[in-house]
Amino acid sequence: LQDPCSNCPAGTFCDNNRNQICSPCPPNSFSSAGGQRTCDICRQCKGVFRTRKECSSTSNAECDCTPGFHCLGAGCSMCEQDCKQGQELTKKGCKDCCFGTFNDQKRGICRPWTNCSLDGKSVLVNGTKERDVVCGPSPADLSPGASSVTPPAPAREPGHSPQ
């Protein structure tokens, strides 16, 4: 025998209290598929979250983050504070990248400068907190008298790989 609830479309639920009649989802709830016995509560975008898409009877609300924050996790489950380029987020907030690392975005973590010597190249432009090093031709390719830029040795930081 066919389940009468299977006839209930999205945006409704199969109301057991009313002889399995298809009733519309109450305000602030939705059902995104047919045949549902209950409607789901709409997500509310509060605090650092802001509404990107309003809830409807057939689809949940979608949130993004207020300015100064960015989304993290599936469906923007968290809002994380933006930092400036050259910084990364820690427990205490935004901190400058350690020597030998950089971040060219407002989010994410500081990453080490590229190790140019891995490809047999030299450092053409030094790295900064905001930018990676630029690798140039291999030292052997440099014309006589030319020299590559060597970054200063870090002071008391853990050993960064040689450039």
Epitope: T90, K91, I109, P112, W113, N115, E157
Partner: antibody, heavy 121, light 112 residues
Amino acid sequence: EVQLVQSGAEVKKPGSSVKVSCKASGYTFTSYYIYWVRQAPGQGLEWIGNIWPGNGGTFYGEKFMGRATFTADTSTSTAYMELSSLRSEDTAVYYCARRPDYSGDDYFDYWGQGTLVTVSS
Amino acid sequence: NVMLTQPHSVSESPGKTVTISCKLNSGNIGSYYVHWYQQRPGSSPTTMIYRDDKRPDGVPDRFSGSIDSSSNSASLTISGLKTEDEADYYCHSYDSTITPVFGGGTKLTVLG
């Protein structure tokens, strides 16, 4: 499913080198730090260093500078740790671990199963 | 050098509550997150608490983490102790964001 699978146990002679591999799967290998940590028998966890596979950039703990070398092969999503001039005190289980990109002081969310390196004459 | 100091061992009976401390010798315990790992014999560490007080999915709510700035230390508390909680526990924080620091580890024995 994120996984870090390490190479098998090794027995080495003092003065020789060992190379341990850590094959990553289930995530974008180039977008997360891989840390190397070791644990001597009956001892605690000790940081060796870390690599950013995206560009091969590395950091080494002071104790391991000049002896440890980290590399990463992005084509196979495998990180390597080579330790040279081995001595008996290097006998330990060596772990690779992944750090999320949420913050600069985050935890290690996935660990390899560990590789036992025994240094004995 | 930054160090995290843990008691070498703690023991308690099943059903009781135990707290493992992790004291920072210099700097401010509030500067960087503290994380806690459980390690059973022959196994890799697994995360029990991350970012001071958060529990990963699958970790029972009997495990909780806290920070006490007055004593410059972090704590892992396990309530309703079970025999399966017997393991080594390690705290983990940072000296700088590229230099992780681990506590020496605490062996938890569940009596009985």
